[in-house]
Interface confidence: low
């Protein structure tokens, strides 16, 4: 049987580093394939070579392995605003990133979307825009932070969190709340 994935890691540890246990004969340790190649046939016996083949165009392996197939090269997600930083090679996947003055917002471990860094209009930059984090803005007096933009306190309603920041101004804003609120 092909081992369960957890078992496979345990069984690999029986062999020295850079080798793996033969799936049909656990007394044989075969040499892993170099990055850029994949396992075509297990080694026939002790001290004999593993049959590794180079990855075909459009596929890669980035580390020594005993994978039966190379991995398909990633394509940058244009609909997420991604751009290609470096092309796929046999031993390295495509590297995708964002344009200048953009940051990555990760929706999941492997999926990110590119967004423009906030410019902190009506405020100052507290922390510069990073690869994976938007600019952190501090707003000038008379403005409050909403979705990382400095918005005029005239748009602050008593029911919102901004009331603390806009307290001096809020008294001058009339008729913007329902009459039932206090």
């Amino acid at each position: 049987l092909v081992p369960h994935l957890g078992d496979r890691e345990k069984r690999d540890s029986v062999c020295p580093q850079g080798k793996y246990i033969h799936p049909q004969n656990n007394s044989i340790c075969c040499t892993k394939c170099h990055k850029g190649t994949y396992l075509y046939n297990d080694c026939p016996g002790p001290g004999q070579d593993t049959d590794c083949r180079e990855c075909e165009s459009g596929s890669f392996t980035a580390s020594e392995n005993h994978l039966r197939h190379c991995l398909s090269c990633s394509k940058c997600r244009k609909e997420m605003g991604q751009v290609e930083i470096s092309s796929c090679t046999v031993d390295r996947d495509t590297v995708c990133g964002c344009r200048k003055n953009q940051y990555r917002h990760y929706w999941s471990e492997n999926l990110f979307q590119c967004f423009n860094c906030s410019l902190c209009l009506n405020g100052t930059v507290h922390l510069s825009c990073q690869e994976k984090q938007n600019t952190v803005c501090t707003c000038h007096a008379g403005f409050f932070l909403r979705e990382n933009e400095c918005v005029s306190c005239s748009n602050c309603k008593k029911s919102l969190e901004c009331t603390k920041l806009c307290l001096p101004q809020i008294e001058n804003v009339k008729g913007t709340e329902d009459s039932g609120t206090t």
């Epitope: 994935l5 890691e9 392996t61 392995n65 994978l67 039966r68 197939h69 991995l71 398909s72 394509k75 492997n110």
Partner: nanobody
Framework: EVQLLESGGGLVQPGGSLRLSCAAS????????MGWVRQAPGKGLEWVSQ????????YYAHSVKGRFTISRDNSKNTLYLQMNSLRAEDTAVYYC????????????WGQGTLVTVSS
């Protein structure tokens, strides 16, 4: 959103055949190797079969080799598993999955289809 929808499971007698299908959507099907894994009642996951993105390479667990055939139709975004000479020990929930080759290699799973082999 990635979706994998398996079908074709059911009750079959020992020695019988079934063909499982997996309809894929929400990702570029042609880009990925695909696989089938199964989980027998009360047991862990077992890797059953795998097929490269262009269908030129296939791989089978020794327990199913010669009896099961994996295939794919990239024009229909569908993965198949033809299961012949079924045995009681093939009883399991069969999952279609996208193979990424990392140590958590099946990043996306379907909901599974139950295959019961019993007389």
């Amino acid at each position: 959103e990635v979706q994998l929808l398996e079908s074709g499971g059911g009750l079959v007698q020992p020695g019988g055949s079934l063909r499982l299908s997996c309809a894929a959507s929400g990702f570029t099907f042609l880009k990925y190797s695909m696989g089938w894994v199964r989980q027998a009642p009360g047991k862990g996951l077992e890797w059953v079969s795998q097929i490269s993105n262009t269908a030129d390479r296939t791989y089978y667990a020794h327990s199913v080799k010669g009896r099961f055939t994996i295939s794919r139709d990239n024009s229909k975004n569908t993965l198949y598993l033809q299961m012949n000479s079924l045995r009681a020990e093939d009883t399991a929930v069969y999952y279609c999955a996208i193979y990424t080759g990392r140590w958590a290699p099946f990043e996306y799973w379907g909901q599974g289809t139950l295959v019961t082999v019993s007389s």
